[in-house]
C-alpha cells in the first residue's frame, strides 16, 4: 500500500513538475526590466527564450520573436537545449511511469517489469529536473553577470549631452517557476526510485521436493509446473534487474507529438 502511494505521489509530483517546466520554457518573462530606479515606467521590457516583449503604459503589448538561430548567444541556445531535453525526458518518463503504476493492470505484466519501468521513469524524472534546474541557473547567472556589467556602464556619454541608458534586466517569473518545477520533477523522480525498491519481489528459492503418492513410485518435480504455478528455480520473476533486457510484457515508448514544445 505504501509503495503504491509513494509511486502514485511520485508520478503526480513529477507530472506537476514537468507541466511547470513546459510552462517556464514557454513563458516570456525569463528576464524583466529592472524597475529599481524607475518604478513607474512607460515602456516595460521583458524577455523569454523565444521572444522579447514590451508592455506599454498604453496597455498594448508587442512581442518580437528571435527569428535567427546563429545570431543568438550560445548561452541562450544552451538554456533552450537544456529545457527541451528536460521536457522530452520528462514526457517519456511520464509515458513509462503510466504503464509502471501498480494501480494500473496491463495484461500479465509482472512486478519485476513494473519495478524496472518505475526505476527507468524515476531516473528520467531526476535527469529532467536537473536539466531544468541547470537551464534556469545558467540563465540566472547570465542575468546577474549582465546586470552588474550594465550597472557599471549605466550611462555612456555620447557627445556630452546625449545619454544612452542601458535597460537592466532582473529575474523574471519564469526562473522561479523553472526552479520550483525542476525541484518537483527531481523529488518525483526520487520518489519513483524509492517506490521501485518496494515493487521488486523478494527472491525466493524453492528446493525441489519429491512427493510420493501412496501406491505410486512417481516423483514429481515442481519445475514441471512452472508455467502455471510460477515455482521453480528458473522462473521468469526471479531476477529483478536484468541489465536493461526487456521482457515482452514491457512496452517501449517513443516521443509522441505532444512531447514537443
Amino acid at each position: 500500500m505504501a509503495v503504491t502511494a509513494c509511486q502514485g505521489l511520485g508520478f503526480v509530483v513529477s507530472l506537476i513538475g514537468i507541466a511547470g517546466i513546459i510552462a517556464a520554457t514557454c513563458m516570456d518573462q525569463w528576464s524583466t526590466q529592472d524597475l529599481y530606479n524607475n518604478p513607474v515606467t512607460a515602456v516595460f521590457n521583458y524577455q523569454g527564450l523565444w521572444r522579447s516583449c514590451v508592455r506599454e503604459s498604453s496597455g498594448f503589448t508587442e512581442c518580437r520573436g528571435y527569428f535567427t538561430l546563429l545570431g543568438l548567444p550560445a548561452m541562450l541556445q544552451a538554456v533552450r537545449a537544456l529545457m527541451i531535453v528536460g521536457i522530452v525526458l520528462g514526457a517519456i518518463g511520464l509515458l513509462v511511469s503510466i504503464f509502471a503504476l501498480k494501480c494500473i493492470r496491463i495484461g500479465s505484466m509482472e512486478d519485476s517489469a513494473k519495478a524496472n519501468m518505475t526505476l527507468t521513469s524515476g531516473i528520467m524524472f531526476i535527469v529532467s529536473g536537473l536539466c531544468a534546474i541547470a537551464g534556469v541557473s545558467v540563465f540566472a547567472n547570465m542575468l546577474v553577470t549582465n546586470f552588474w556589467m550594465s550597472t557599471a556602464n549605466m550611462y555612456t556619454g555620447m557627445g556630452g549631452m546625449v545619454q544612452t541608458v542601458q535597460t537592466r534586466y532582473t529575474f523574471g517569473a519564469a526562473l522561479f517557476v523553472g526552479w520550483v518545477a525542476g525541484g518537483l520533477t527531481l523529488i518525483g523522480g526520487v520518489m519513483m526510485c524509492i517506490a521501485c525498491r518496494g515493487l521488486a519481489p523478494e527472491e525466493t528459492n524453492y528446493k525441489a521436493v519429491s512427493y510420493h503418492a501412496s501406491g505410486h513410485s512417481v516423483a514429481y518435480k515442481p519445475g514441471g509446473f512452472k508455467a502455471s504455478t510460477g515455482f521453480g528455480s528458473n522462473t521468469k520473476n526471479k531476477k529483478i534487474y536484468d541489465g536493461g533486457a526487456r521482457t515482452e510484457d514491457e512496452v517501449q515508448s517513443y516521443p509522441s507529438k505532444h512531447d514537443y514544445v
Epitope: 524607475n38 513607474v40 515606467t41 515602456v43 514590451v54 498604453s58 496597455g59 498594448f60 545619454q163 535597460t167
Partner: antibody, heavy 118, light 113 residues
Framework: QIQLVQSGSELKKPGASVKVSCKAS????????MNWVRQAPGQGLEWMGW????????TYAEDFKGRFVFSLDTSVATAYLQITSLKAEDTAVYYC???????????WGQGTLVTVSS | DIVMTQSPDSLAVSLGERATINCKSS????????????LTWYQQKPGQPPKLLIY???TRESGVPDRFSGSGSGTDFTLTISSLQAEDLAVYYC?????????FGQGTKLEIK
C-alpha cells in the same frame, strides 16, 4: 467614431478653483489611459500627466504636482482636471488626450481655455 | 527627464518642395524588447488640437497622407514632407513616449516661402 468633448472656456480669479471635464465617446474610457496636456498662449505643448484607466491612479509631471488633480467618473465616461489656487501663469488651453499604442496621444479633445485674471 | 530638441524653430519651404524637420532626444528611445523607437510626430494647425501623424518613429497613422514620413533611430529623428501642400502649414511637434514624464519638442513652425 472616437470623440473627446471638453467643457467650455473658463474665466477665473487668482486663488479660485476650476474643474475641466472631458467626455469620452466611441470607446470604453476604462480601457485607455487619459492624458492632460497644457498649452500656454503662443507656447508649445507640456505634458501634465495621465490617469491609469483600470485603477484610476494618476501620475503627475513634476511641475504639476500639488494643485492639479486628475479623476475619472466611469459612470458618465468622463475625465476631470481640477486646478486649485489658480495663478495667472495657469492661463492656458488644457487638452485631454487618449493614450494609445506606441504611447502616443491619438485622440484629443478640442481644448478648454482657462483664463486667470483679476 | 528626457529633453527633446527640434530644429529648426521655423522653416520656410515652397509649395511642392521637400520639408525636413529634425528632432534630437537626450536619451535613447529605442526599446530593446520590440526594437521600436518611442517617438511620435504631431501636427497642430492654428486654433486646433494637435493631430497624430507618425508613431514608433516611422509608422504612419491611418488617414495620414503618404507624403509624410518619419525616420531615425536611437536619439536622432526626422520628419519629412516630400511635397509640401498648402494644408501642411502648421506647427510640428515631436514627443517621446519612452519614459515618464512624456516630453515634447519646442515645436517647428512650417511656413510657405
Amino acid at each position: 467614431q472616437i470623440q473627446l468633448v471638453q467643457s467650455g472656456s473658463e474665466l477665473k480669479k487668482p486663488g479660485a478653483s476650476v474643474k475641466v471635464s472631458c467626455k469620452a465617446s466611441g470607446y470604453t474610457l476604462t480601457n485607455y489611459g487619459m492624458n492632460w496636456v497644457r498649452q500656454a498662449p503662443g507656447q508649445g505643448l507640456e505634458w501634465m500627466g495621465w490617469i491609469r484607466p483600470n485603477t484610476g491612479e494618476p501620475t503627475y509631471a513634476e511641475d504639476f504636482k500639488g494643485r492639479f488633480v486628475f479623476s475619472l467618473d466611469t459612470s458618465v465616461a468622463t475625465a476631470y482636471l481640477q486646478i486649485t489656487s489658480l495663478k495667472a501663469e495657469d492661463t492656458a488651453v488644457y487638452y485631454c488626450a487618449r493614450l494609445y499604442r506606441g504611447n502616443t496621444l491619438d485622440n484629443w479633445g478640442q481644448g478648454t481655455l482657462v483664463t486667470v485674471s483679476s | 527627464d528626457i529633453v527633446m530638441t527640434q530644429s529648426p524653430d521655423s522653416l520656410a519651404v515652397s509649395l511642392g518642395e521637400r520639408a525636413t524637420i529634425n528632432c534630437k532626444s537626450s536619451q535613447n528611445l529605442l526599446s530593446s524588447g520590440n526594437q521600436r523607437n518611442y517617438l511620435t510626430w504631431y501636427q497642430q494647425k492654428p486654433g486646433q488640437p494637435p493631430k497624430l501623424l507618425i508613431y514608433w518613429a516611422s509608422t504612419r497613422e491611418s488617414g495620414v497622407p503618404d507624403r509624410f514620413s518619419g525616420s531615425g533611430s536611437g536619439t536622432d529623428f526626422t520628419l519629412t514632407i516630400s511635397s509640401l501642400q498648402a494644408e501642411d502649414l502648421a506647427v510640428y511637434y515631436c514627443q517621446q513616449g519612452y519614459s515618464f514624464p512624456f516630453t515634447f519638442g519646442q515645436g517647428t513652425k512650417l511656413e510657405i516661402k
